[in-house]
Amino acid sequence: KESCDVQLYIKRQSEHSILAGDPFELECPVKYCANRPHVTWCKLNGTTCVKLEDRQTSWKEEKNISFFILHFEPVLPNDNGSYRCSANFQSNLIESHSTTLYVTDVKSASERPSKDEMASRPWLLY
């Protein structure tokens, strides 16, 4: 039996390796039954998650799921960090797992590190 609770489909410990200067869309897949919930993005600062107020967001609707998208146009070095989406549903706050963006400074395509290298070299980011 399908649950009619709102569910946010961000994987625990998920990571994205991205380049500064590129556009990037961070998706929060949202499953709901009737009314689409109000969804927001925040960025983790220690144990608190700071709501992202003045950022471009949009919805993308598909048949079985909707995506609340946070736009990075372009990605900046200080976009590095962990993000979480939250949904307000029937006066309950549902929080996703956090997802981490690893931003590396722009390099030529031939110098771009692989995903494996990015995962093993977080010091590249600072």
Epitope: Q7, L8, Y9, I10, K11, R12, S14, E15, H16, S17, L44, T47, E95, H97, S98, K115, D116, A119
Partner: antibody, heavy 119, light 112 residues
Framework: EVQLVESGGGLVQPGRSLRLSCTTS????????IHWFRQAPGKGLEWVGR????????KYTASFKGRATISADGSKSIAYLQMNSLKTEDTAVYYC????????????WGQGTLVTVSS | DIQMTQSPSSLSASVGDRVTITCRSS???????????LNWLQQKPGKAPKRLIY???KLDSGVPSRFSGSGSGTDFTLTISSLQPEDFATYYC?????????FGQGTKLEIK
């Protein structure tokens, strides 16, 4: 029916490479993390690493970094473990497992494939 | 790396017995979402491991209710309330809170 089937094991000479496959069915591989584990004869379980088939991100145990590569083809629902520079101590049963990434709702394991490294 | 220490390493018991296996981690398994990602696996000779319990105390579907998990922080317990013949196996705890994920050394449960 959910299935994970490992293949590609067998006898390999030291110094050679081997690619193991994990063919999955019955669930969407992109909703999961694919893990590889191994178990030497008579020993405990060891985590090799994991892959996120949705974006290719991988994590490894330090001792496997640089020698193992985990990848996945989401469109074919197959995951791979490439092991290079094999040593006799790499002799083990290798297991793939698929763990749902969002709410931990399932954790399926394959039956394992035996890799024997010997000259 | 986080060390996972299971005790006992082996255990003899009889059908109907209540059995407790403990697992201690070298640091807290509490993730920043407030949950501890501690799993218990069962492995029978010549077979693949099977997940029994996840998130410390949640039973996988199809796992009999005689199995239960408890604990928090660094100390965790697997309890089998009334041993059945099919429960004789090796049990492992493993954590997937912190990279690299690590296992306990296993507890072999044998028939007395």
């Amino acid at each position: 029916e959910v299935q994970l089937v490992e293949s590609g094991g067998g006898l390999v000479q030291p110094g050679r490479s081997l690619r193991l496959s994990c063919t999955t069915s019955g669930f969407n591989i992109k909703d999961t993390y694919i893990h590889w584990f191994r178990q030497a004869p008579g020993k405990g379980l060891e985590w090799v690493g994991r892959n996120d088939p949705a974006n290719g991100n991988t994590k490894y145990t330090a001792s496997f970094k640089g020698r193992a590569t985990i990848s996945a083809d989401g469109s074919k629902s197959i995951a791979y473990l490439q092991m290079n520079s094999l040593k006799t101590e790499d002799t083990a049963v290798y297991y793939c497992a698929s763990y749902e990434g969002y709410y931990e709702r399932f954790g399926y394991w394959g039956q394992g494939t035996l890799v024997t490294v010997s000259s | 790396d986080i060390q996972m220490t299971q005790s006992p390493s082996s255990l003899s018991a009889s059908v109907g017995d209540r059995v407790t296996i403990t697992c201690r981690s070298s640091q807290s398994l509490l993730d920043r979402d407030g949950k501890s990602y501690l799993n218990w696996l069962q492995q029978k000779p010549g077979k693949a491991p099977k997940r029994l319990i996840y998130l410390v105390s949640k039973l996988d579907s199809g796992v009999p209710s005689r199995f239960s998990g408890s604990g928090s922080g660094t100390d965790f317990t697997l309890t089998i309330s009334s041993l059945q013949p099919e429960d004789f196996a090796t049990y492992y705890c493993w954590q997937d809170t912190h990279f690299p994920y690590t296992f306990g050394q296993g507890t072999k449960l044998e028939i007395k």
